[in-house]
């Protein structure tokens, strides 16, 4: 056969063999010529071995340009690909020799121990095993051990040819440990040799460092750190670290593979680097390759040493924060140290725990905010090694957008009487303190809830024309008054006025309020009824359980048939501020309820009593008044509200204290519940009497000892009780000092 | 700057040897695996043989397997590719790339083999 | 082995036009990771390859914008946009999801 492309005059070197394939037997003599047209050469195979010296390579006698290739006495070995080229030319003749050697058919490999097939475990991928053979036409089949198998050719993916060897599918014989070819020659078995099988794979899926973030010592600790390499199946790793002091006396470096679950298509691989006192020059860049040979992964990690444990707060750390009602608050606590500070946070001096409300950790989490979380907080940095502190101080200061404190009270409709004056109040409370409050009013018949005016949850006043009380034309004669500030419930408020001169016009009227966190409004019903009048007795608002009535009075000759109603659900809920139906235009809501009609001399008065009020007693009630003349309706609302039973608290500065005789003692003892409790005094266990010493004064609720004496030490307590039970508060009084013994001195005695 | 660059081509007779070297400068050698790649006089890019970091574990392609030996002094920041009995179709213009994730991220110039009698 | 096909030369393309340059696989390169296995290379007259596109379509360290790798588990794109005289070369796709490692036959640049 001829191989190589054909130049411009040259032909293909000639053989004296005019054949592809030669077979010869066994020690006979293979002896080829070779002819050309330049200098010629021969290649034959294992000619890097030492077989070399049998063969035989000559000029022949004959002729330039040609040469002779002698093998005395072939062996089995001798069988292949014998090459005639010319020099520096791809033009070659070839012919394939098979020395047909029946007790060695295999052609032994250069190296005569054993092979090595590289295989991966691809269910598309064939190896081939390169047991050639000195015959052409072997039976061979393929032995694999442990356990052993026999794989014969069968036409398709199996198969053996003398010149390549036996090819099979890879990951038919992952299993193996070794290989051979066998032939079968006249009952004879003829072996190849051992070929070791390695089953490849190279791919890693990942490097991960551990710790991999955020590693800082302090001189002369220990660092260690784990390299785990993840990579298919059969793979070999090598690692290899690179660090600041790659010279390290102190490091030692251990390498191992993890067990990984069986059945797992992973492995893993760990490569520890350990440096036992470590130093400043071995702060920096640490990385670590995995390497399985056709893939390299690497990952690398930033070590900090510290000269000492230190601990101190970071330039980014807040000294004041501001938040509005109901955000979330996050005061971190930002910090440099080495190793990670212990943290404590302490609210106006006392320790945060964490619990629903608050996370007190490396960052202060207030979950909703609210007023009472205004205060001083204090974080506390201690260095767990050297126990070194810092503090910190932050000021959370929490603003409230503009409160309306009446909103909450309001009822759909109050009525007012005809011509009289009337103030209205909206008592504001924010934080910063709003920095105005605008009133601004409408005419009722401007603003009625009408079908046409869809009212929606977002905009529950279908008027939008609001104006300016300054501009009062075609309305009530308004005047406001200046903002007042008032502390009330124990937080300063602002609390603006309108004053309606005569109350001539049914209106709506809107106080606004802005602060810098937002704003809040609250409108009025302002009803002008010339109808009855509704009239409190007593005139106060009710506690349960105690009786009140509601008086409907109207004037005998204007109006008739006086009723007593309760408004009922509306149709619509009602939000904060939105306008209900008038009520006498739609009777459907109301619930008529049982009264009792009293005369005098010009008015008819149409008594409701509820004896034993209770909280479902609350709401609005109309009295409604036809008038006799024209059959018009007159309604008159009026809200009722009735206080809760609170069982009696005490709140006061009554602590344990320390004075000096002769001095005064100035205590107060407030107590809140409903109905309002009566508050009593004693001095260890015993009633406390009034004398010109003891002064008792608000209602018991200010207790003064004048000029105190060694005999009023002892334990004072304030006790407060009504019908719903008693609260008590108790201080323990020391005095100091040496009692001076004068006749003029007064004394004071008390049981 | 990365630097690879190649030495020890030549015209070599066929059934002869010859070792390729590999300097490696600007980086951190023992730290990536390193590649041979050969360009033929046709262009094509064939890969040769690669060796993982420590020099434990390498590959070959099969035509060059039992014949090639490829080898690293990582002290020394050099690759070597040892080649017996070169046929010739071993001529080609052989380079060496530096390997990370299995991708060839830097190449060397190359040096070429002539493999011919 | 996988076998990788490339077109000898591309669609001829003038200076700041777009061109695509295929290549196909006989095998998928999408690995069970998620990832498919296929890269890119420059090899510009007179110089060594350098590495463009890595996983199919990410740019590596200082590759212009103007390269992009899309594909399939078996066929492949790099669209170069806005073609200038130093994308001119030989572009050779590689697998790398099948050991051995094989390279395409290379796509030759080709300007109007």
């Known amino acids: 056969a001829s191989v190589g492309l054909p130049s411009v005059s040259l032909d293909l070197p000639r053989l004296s063999i005019q054949k592809d394939i030669l077979t010869i037997k066994a020690n006979t003599t293979l002896q080829i010529t070779c002819r050309g047209q330049r200098d010629l050469d021969w290649l034959w195979p294992n000619n890097q071995s030492g077989s070399e010296q049998r063969v035989e390579v000559t000029e022949c006698s004959d002729g330039l340009f040609c040469k002779t290739l002698t093998i005395p006495k072939v062996i089995g070995n001798d069988t292949g690909a014998y090459k005639c080229f010319y020099r520096e030319t791809d033009l070659a003749s070839v012919i394939y020799v098979y020395v047909q050697d029946y007790r060695s058919p295999f052609i032994a490999s250069v190296s005569d121990q054993h092979g090595v097939v590289y295989i991966t475990e691809n269910k598309n991928k064939t190896v081939v095993i390169p047991c050639l053979g000195s015959i052409s036409n072997l039976n061979v089949s393929l032995c694999a051990r442990y356990p052993e198998k026999r794989f014969v050719p069968d036409g398709n993916r199996i198969s053996w040819d003398s010149k390549k060897g036996f090819t099979i599918p890879s990951y038919m014989i992952s299993y193996a440990g070794m290989v051979f070819c066998e032939a079968k020659i006249n009952d004879e078995s003829y072996q190849s040799i051992m070929y070791i099988v390695v089953v490849v794979g190279y791919r890693i899926y990942d490097v991960v460092l551990s710790p991999s973030h955020g590693i800082e010592l302090s001189v002369g600790e220990k660092l260690v750190l784990n390299c785990t390499a993840r990579t298919e199946l059969n793979v070999g790793i090598d690692f290899n670290w690179e660090y600041p002091s790659s010279k390290h006396q102190h490091k030692k470096l251990v390498n191992r593979d993890l067990k990984t679950q069986s059945g797992s298509e992973m492995k893993k691989f760990l490569s520890t680097l350990t440096i036992d006192g470590i130093t400043r020059s071995d702060q920096g860049l640490y990385t670590c390759a995995a390497s399985s040979g056709l893939m390299t992964k690497k990952n690398s990690t930033f070590v900090r040493v510290h000269e000492k444990p230190f601990v101190a707060f970071g330039s980014g750390m807040e000294s004041l924060v501001e938040a509005t009602v109901g955000e979330r608050v996050r005061i971190p606590a930002k910090y440099l140290g080495y190793p990670p500070p212990e943290i404590k946070w302490y609210k106006n001096g006392i320790p945060l725990e964490s619990n629903h409300t608050i996370k007190a950790g490396h960052v202060l989490t207030i979950m909703e905010v609210s007023e009472r979380d205004t205060g001083n907080y204090t974080v506390i940095l201690t260095n767990p090694i050297s126990k070194e502190k810092q503090s910190h101080v932050v000021s959370l200061v929490v603003y409230v957008p503009p409160q309306i404190g009446e909103k909450s009270l309001i009822s759909p409709v109050d009525s007012y009487q005809y011509g009289t004056t009337q103030t209205l109040t909206c008592t504001v409370y924010a934080i910063p303190p709003p920095h105005h409050i605008h009133w601004y009013w409408q005419l009722e018949e401007e603003c009625a809830n009408e079908p046409s005016h869809a009212v929606s949850v977002t905009n529950p006043y279908p008027c939008e024309e609001w104006r300016s009380v300054e501009d009062f034309q075609g309305g009530n004669k308004i005047e406001v008054n200046k903002n007042q500030f008032a502390l009330i419930e124990g937080k300063n408020k602002t609390v603006s006025t309108l004053v309606i001169q005569a109350a001539n016009v049914s209106a709506l009227y809107k106080c606004e309020a802005v602060n810098k966190v937002g704003r809040g409004e609250r409108v009025i019903s302002f009803h002008v009824t010339r109808g009855p009048e509704i009239t409190l007795q007593p005139d106060m608002q009710p506690t349960e359980q105690e009786s009140v009535s509601l008086w409907c009075t109207a004037d005998r000759s204007t109006f008739e048939n006086l009723t007593w109603y309760k408004l009922g659900p509306q149709p619509l809920p009602i939000h904060v501020g939105e306008l209900p139906t008038p009520v006498c235009k739609n009777l459907d809501t109301l619930w008529k309820l049982n009264a009792t009609m009293f005369s005098n001399s010009t008015n008819d008065i149409l008594i409701m009593e509820l004896k034993n009020a209770s909280l479902q007693d609350q709401g609005d009630y109309v009295c409604l008044a036809q008038d006799r003349k024209t059959k018009k309706r007159h309604c008159v609302v009026r809200q009722l509200t009735v206080l809760e039973r609170v069982a009696p608290t005490i709140t006061g500065n009554l602590e344990n204290q320390t004075t000096s005789i002769g001095e005064s003692i100035e205590v107060s003892c407030t107590a809140s519940g409903n109905p309002p409790p009566q508050i009593m005094w004693f001095k260890d266990n015993e009633t406390l009497v009034e004398d010109s010493g003891i002064v008792l004064k608000d209602g018991n609720r200010n207790l003064t000892i004048r000029r105190v004496r060694k005999e009023d030490e002892g334990l004072y307590t304030c006790q407060a009780c009504s019908v719903l039970g008693c609260a008590k508060v108790e201080a323990f009084f020391i005095i100091e000092g040496a009692q001076e013994k004068t006749n003029l001195e007064h004394h004071h005695h008390h049981h | 700057e990365v630097q690879l660059v190649e030495s020890g081509g030549d015209l070599v007779k066929p059934g002869g040897s010859l070792k390729l070297s590999c300097a490696a400068s600007g980086f951190t050698f023992s730290m990536y695996g390193m590649s041979w790649v050969r360009q033929t006089p046709d262009k094509r890019l064939e890969w040769v043989a690669s060796i993982s970091i420590g020099g434990s574990y390498t590959y070959y392609a099969d035509s060059v397997e039992g014949r090639f030996t490829i080898s690293r002094e990582n002290a020394k920041n050099t690759l070597f590719l040892q080649m017996n009995s070169l046929k010739s179709e071993d001529t080609a213009l052989y380079y060496c790339?530096?390997?990370?994730?299995?991708?060839?991220?830097?190449w060397g110039h190359g040096t070429t083999l002539t493999v011919s009698s | 082995d996988v076998m990788i096909t490339q077109d000898e030369l591309s669609n001829p393309v003038t200076f700041g036009e777009s061109v695509s340059i295929s290549c196909r696989s006989s095998?998928?390169?999408?690995?069970?990771?998620?990832?498919?296995?296929l890269n890119w290379f420059l090899q510009r007259p007179g110089q060594s390859p350098q590495l463009l596109i890595y996983?199919?379509?990410t740019r590596a360290s200082g590759v212009s914008d103007r390269f992009s790798g899309s594909g399939s588990g078996t066929d492949f794109t790099l669209e170069i946009s806005r073609v200038k005289a130093e994308d001119v070369g030989i572009y050779y796709c590689q697998q790398l999801v099948e050991y051995p490692f094989t390279f395409g036959s290379g796509t030759k640049l080709e300007i109007k």
């Open positions: 095998k998928s390169l999408l690995y069970k990771d998620g990832k498919t296995y």
């Open positions: 790339a530096r390997e990370m994730d299995g991708n060839y991220d830097y």
């Open positions: 996983l199919m379509s």
